[in-house]
């Protein structure tokens, strides 16, 4: 018999009080954690890392810091104004030996368009990345460097889920041993060749991503080469065989009726917590219809919400979700018509998702008013359109060229949108701020780590 492969990286996910404040409830926070983990699980499972396949992720434990924990002295993430390096360090100061990786999710607007930060794994002699154990460093503190952090905010705007999922995959990619992509083979989005360029950059691109191009949620060959070397050496140290769901992680998985966490976390009157005996844990209590852990259409009193209750707000591209009185799930809602304006008139709805550019409404394609083409820097945060496959026609929506469509009205990109050919993000003043991909690295050189660690942290 062949022994089952160790291919599952178990995660500890914490969220800070600001993440909770934005999403509003424990259930909504757990849904976010679940969606992020499922997204990276799909990406990694479908990547062949030089013969190592089916790499998957499982949440082993979560900790949700609510707004009530904002003043709790035992909550290391309670401080309001922390830079990104300090935030990662606070995560790393905890002991995470029981996990493959430990992440903190936040809703903070870090400087310079930084959406995440993580320690980079290496095949040997590494400090950082997957399976790294807690040890004493030269600043006299014990640290776990199997860590990373991500934020869902950028220049005052919240990033779309697809971008946040790619940010998570990117940071975990660092933990798995991949540096940023470089060179023509691995940064096709920077190519002068239009055919290559249109597929965009890969997950480990150093700067900005829109998340909707073909390559955006794939690893480059450069990343695959680096990650496979680290997996070869490290996965036996802490990866586990995939299999049984983990009762207590807050996510309802195959074979579970509900999951409200461990006894210290379970606030649910409906579900037996994970500290209960085998036959009872993660099962509904007798006489209870449902548990809020199953979905937003279950009340705290363990009954299905009535037929008229709203469970999902009306969005730019889909009608509101309404409970139906017989399940905890919030049912799918109908999409709004294709080409309905969305994201403040910068995009259009396609199949219920705010996915296309406003240019598509008029049979045009979005393009970048990029400074390398001699365009005015002031236009870098304008929505620009061109005739299909004809970059020479690229012009701002406010230009005379497109006045018949936009009546001379300049449509500006949302703050936090990629600009200047994905080199940066628009700020609130509509300036394109270039991403300094290695900014935190430089700042860390002045901080507490010994010189040999400099190369092992990355955005």
């Amino acid at each position: 018999t062949t022994s089952a492969e160790k291919n599952t990286c178990q995660l500890y996910i914490q969220t800070d009080h600001l993440f909770f404040k934005y999403y509003g409830t424990r259930e909504a926070v757990i849904a976010q954690i679940s969606s992020h983990v499922k997204a990276i699980d799909t990406i990694y499972q479908t990547t062949d890392f030089s013969g190592i396949r089916n790499i998957s992720f499982m949440v082993k434990r979560i900790r949700i810091n609510t707004t009530a924990d904002e003043k709790d002295p035992t909550n290391p993430f309670r401080f309001p104004n922390i830079g990104v390096e300090k935030f990662l360090e606070l995560n790393s100061e905890q002991n995470h030996d029981d996990y493959c990786l430990a992440y903190v999710f936040t809703d903070r607007d870090f400087d310079d368009g930084v959406l995440g930060l993580a320690w980079v794994g290496a095949p040997s002699g590494s400090s950082g990345g997957i399976c790294e154990k807690s040890k004493l460093y030269s600043d006299g503190k014990k640290k776990s460097l199997n860590t990373g952090i991500i934020t869902v905010q950028n220049y005052g705007s919240h990033v779309p889920p697809k971008v946040s999922h790619i940010t998570f995959a990117h940071e975990v990619g660092h933990n798995f041993g991949s540096p940023h992509d470089s060179g023509t083979e691995c940064t096709p989005g920077e190519s002068k060749n239009l055919g290559q360029k249109e597929n965009g950059n890969y997950i480990m691109y150093a700067r900005a991503t829109s998340g909707d191009k073909l390559n955006n949620n794939k690893f480059s060959l450069c990343s695959i080469r680096n990650i496979s070397q680290v997996l070869e050496k490290k996965r036996n140290n802490c990866f586990v065989e995939s299999g049984q769901p983990i009762c207590g992680n807050g996510m309802v998985e195959q074979g579970e009726e509900c999951d409200c966490g461990y006894s210290d976390q379970c606030k649910d009157e409906c579900c037996f917590d994970a500290n209960q005996p085998e036959g009872r844990k993660c099962k509904l209590k007798p006489g209870k219809q449902c548990s809020p852990s199953q979905g937003p259409c279950c009340t705290a009193q363990c009954a299905f919400k009535s037929k008229s209750e709203k469970c999902r707000d009306d969005s730019d591209c889909a009608r509101e979700g309404i409970c139906n009185g017989f399940t905890a799930l919030c049912p799918a809602s109908d999409p709004k018509p294709n080409f309905t304006d969305c994201n403040r008139h910068t995009q259009v709805c396609i199949n219920g998702q705010c996915a296309g550019s406003i240019c598509e409404k008029y049979g045009l394609e979005e393009c970048t008013c990029a400074s390398s083409d001699g365009k005015d820097d002031k236009e870098l945060c304008h929505v620009c359109c061109m005739k299909k496959m004809d970059p020479s026609t690229c012009a701002s929506t406010g230009s005379v060229q497109w006045s018949r469509h936009f009546s001379g009205r300049t449509i500006t990109l949302q703050p936090g949108s990629p600009c200047n050919d994905f080199r940066g993000y628009c700020d609130v003043f509509m300036r394109c701020r270039l991403v300094d991909a290695d900014g935190p690295l430089a700042r860390l050189k002045k901080a507490i780590f010994s010189p040999e660690l400099y190369e092992n942290i990355a955005e």
Epitope: P161, M251, Q254, E256, E257, T327, A328, L329
Partner: nanobody
Framework: KVQLVESGGGLVQAGGSLRLSCAAS????????VGWYRQAPGKQREMVAA???????NYADSVKGRFTISRDNAKNTVYLQMNSLKPEDTAVYYC??????????WGQGTQVTVSS
């Protein structure tokens, strides 16, 4: 992008049975919630059966005891077994799955017509 393909519909007499299938690429039905919906002419689309991520099932009162939702993870397929069909079950039937917390885009659906 998740693509869902429903099949198994057809014309059946009242009291008869049909088994609808919903296929998807990849093993997306594992640990994800699934729903069967229907839309009768001139009416809103409504959910008739749900399977939660853990495998628990729920049914609308109008189909309880007659319809059964199930999934086969190995085949990446979800089923809706419909027994004791009534003329009022006539509709286009759709399946949907929650992927990364969001319902997927609708497929084409499969027409079920129950004659009296």
């Amino acid at each position: 992008k998740v693509q869902l393909v429903e099949s198994g519909g057809g014309l059946v007499q009242a009291g008869g049975s049909l088994r609808l299938s919903c296929a998807a690429s990849g093993n997306i039905f594992i640990n994800n919630a699934v729903g069967w919906y229907r839309q009768a002419p001139g009416k809103q689309r409504e959910m008739v059966a749900a399977m939660l991520s853990g495998g628990s099932t729920n049914y609308a009162d109008s189909v309880k005891g007659r319809f059964t939702i199930s999934r086969d993870n190995a085949k990446n397929t979800v089923y809706l077994q419909m027994n004791s069909l009534k003329p009022e079950d006539t509709a286009v039937y759709y399946c949907n799955v929650q992927v990364n917390g969001t319902w997927a885009r609708w497929g084409q659906g499969t027409q079920v017509t129950v004659s009296s």
